[in-house]
Interface confidence: medium
Amino acid sequence: MQLSQVSDLLTQEQANLTHQKKKLEGQISARQQAEEASQESENELKEMIETLARKLNEKSKEQMELHHQNLNLQETLKRVANCSAPCPQDWIWHGENCYLFSSGSFNWEKSQEKCLSLDAKLLKINSTADLDFIQQAISYSSFPFWMGLSRRNPSYPWLWEDGSPLMPHLFRVRGAVSQTYPSGTCAYIQRGAVYAENCILAAFSICQKKANLRAQ
C-alpha cells in the first residue's frame, strides 16, 4: 500500500469521523431539547395540579361556608316559623309600624273611619325616619294622602288623632294654613311635603298600626 493511498484512507476516515461527530452532536442537542421540553411540560403539569388543588380547596371552603349559611337559614326559618307575621297582608312593615296605603279616595273623616275599621289610625309621623320612609313610599304617586293631623281653626294647634301636638322640627305645614273651614283643616302629605286643606275634600289616605314584633 502506497503512502498516498494511506493518506487518502486517513482523509476519508477523518471525514467519516467528522460526519459521525456532527451526527452525534445533533442527536445530543435534540435529546437535550427534548429533556428541556419534558422538564417544561412537567413544570406546567405541576403548576396545573397546584392550581387545581388550590381551586378545589377554595371550593370546599365555599361549600363549607354555604353549608353553615344553610344551617343558619334553617335556624332563622325555625325561629320565624314560631313568630306570626309583623303585619297583615298588603300592609307595609317599617320599624315598629305597619302601613296601608288606601285604595280609595275619601274625605278625612271617612278615611279615619276606614282606618278604625282596620284596627288602625291615620298616619302619625313620630320621627324623621318615619317621614323619610313615607316620602320614599309615595314619591312616585301624584296623589295627596290624608294623615292623622288636623286642627279646628288657625288659632288652634295642629294635633294628631291621639291628641298629641305636632313637633315643629319634623315638618312645616304648607298651603291653606290660615283658612278656616266649617269641617276643620286637615293635613295631607303629597310628594314629600305636608299641606293644610279642607277636611271635606276627598284624598287617598295612609293607615298605621303597631307591628306585631313579639316572638310566640
Epitope: G104, S141, S142, F143, P144, G192, A193
Partner: antibody, heavy 115, light 107 residues
C-alpha cells in the same frame, strides 16, 4: 312596546258631554297613573287631572271639579275622561299620558264644541 | 296653585347655537320639574325629569339644571330637529302646572 291609543275626533254641541278613551298596551296598566292634559288651538298645555287605574282613585283640577270624571276599565286596560256641560272654550286636543312623569302620550283627540 | 313662568316666550337661533330656556316657579319645587318638547300636531315628548335627569333615548345635547324655584333647560348645539316648543311642568303638588311654553325658531 308601550302605546296609548286614543279615540277619534268628536264634534259636540254646547251643554253636551264627551267621553274620550285611552287604551293602554305594552305595560301593566294598573301600575301607572294615567294623566289627562288638554291643549286649546294655538295655546299651551293644561293639566286636567289623573286616575290611578289600580284603585280607581282620581284627582282633578279645581277648575274642572264637578264637570270632569276619570274612570278606567282594567279588563280592557282603558282609561276614560268624560267632560260634561261643554262650552266653546273646551275646544281642544285632549291627551292621555302615562305618568312617571309623562313618558308616553296618546296621539291626542280633538274635541270641537260648536253650535 | 303654583305658577310656572318660562322665559323667553320665543327665541330665534341657528343650527350649532347654544340655547338656554329658564323656568321659574312661584315657590320652591324641590327639583320636581320636567321639560317637554312639542312639535306642531304632535304630542309632547319628555326630555328631562327630576330637573336634571335625561330621559332615555334623548340626545345628550339636552341638559337640565336648577334648584329651589329656578330651573334651566340647555341645548348645547342646536340641531335642525330641535326647532319646536318647549314646556316646563312642576309636579310637586296638584294641580301640576305648566309654563306657557318657549317657541324655538330658526333664525
Amino acid at each position: 312596546q308601550v302605546q296609548l291609543v286614543q279615540s277619534g275626533a268628536e264634534v259636540k254641541k254646547p251643554g253636551a258631554s264627551v267621553k274620550v278613551s285611552c287604551k293602554a298596551s305594552g305595560y301593566t296598566f294598573t301600575d301607572y297613573e294615567v294623566h289627562w292634559v288638554r291643549q286649546a288651538p294655538g295655546q299651551g298645555l293644561e293639566w286636567m287631572g289623573a286616575i290611578h287605574p289600580g284603585s280607581g282613585g282620581a284627582a282633578y283640577v279645581q277648575k274642572f271639579q264637578g264637570r270632569v270624571t276619570m274612570t278606567r276599565d282594567t279588563s280592557t286596560s282603558t282609561a276614560y275622561m268624560e267632560l260634561s256641560s261643554l262650552r266653546s272654550d273646551d275646544t281642544a286636543v285632549y291627551y292621555c299620558a302615562r305618568w312617571l312623569p309623562m313618558d308616553y302620550w296618546g296621539q291626542g283627540t280633538l274635541v270641537t264644541v260648536s253650535s | 296653585d303654583i305658577q310656572m313662568t318660562q322665559s323667553p316666550s320665543s327665541v330665534s337661533a341657528s343650527v350649532g347655537d347654544r340655547v338656554t330656556i329658564t323656568c321659574r316657579a312661584s315657590q320652591g319645587i324641590n327639583n320636581w320639574l320636567v321639560w317637554y318638547q312639542q312639535k306642531p300636531g304632535k304630542a309632547p315628548k319628555l326630555l328631562i325629569y327630576a330637573a336634571s335627569s335625561l330621559q332615555s333615548g334623548v340626545p345628550s345635547r339636552f341638559s337640565g339644571s336648577g334648584s329651589g324655584a329656578d330651573y334651566t333647560l340647555t341645548i348645547s348645539s342646536l340641531q335642525p330637529e330641535d326647532f319646536a316648543t318647549y314646556y316646563c311642568q312642576q309636579y310637586l303638588i296638584t294641580p301640576y302646572t305648566f309654563g306657557q311654553g318657549t317657541k324655538l325658531e330658526i333664525k
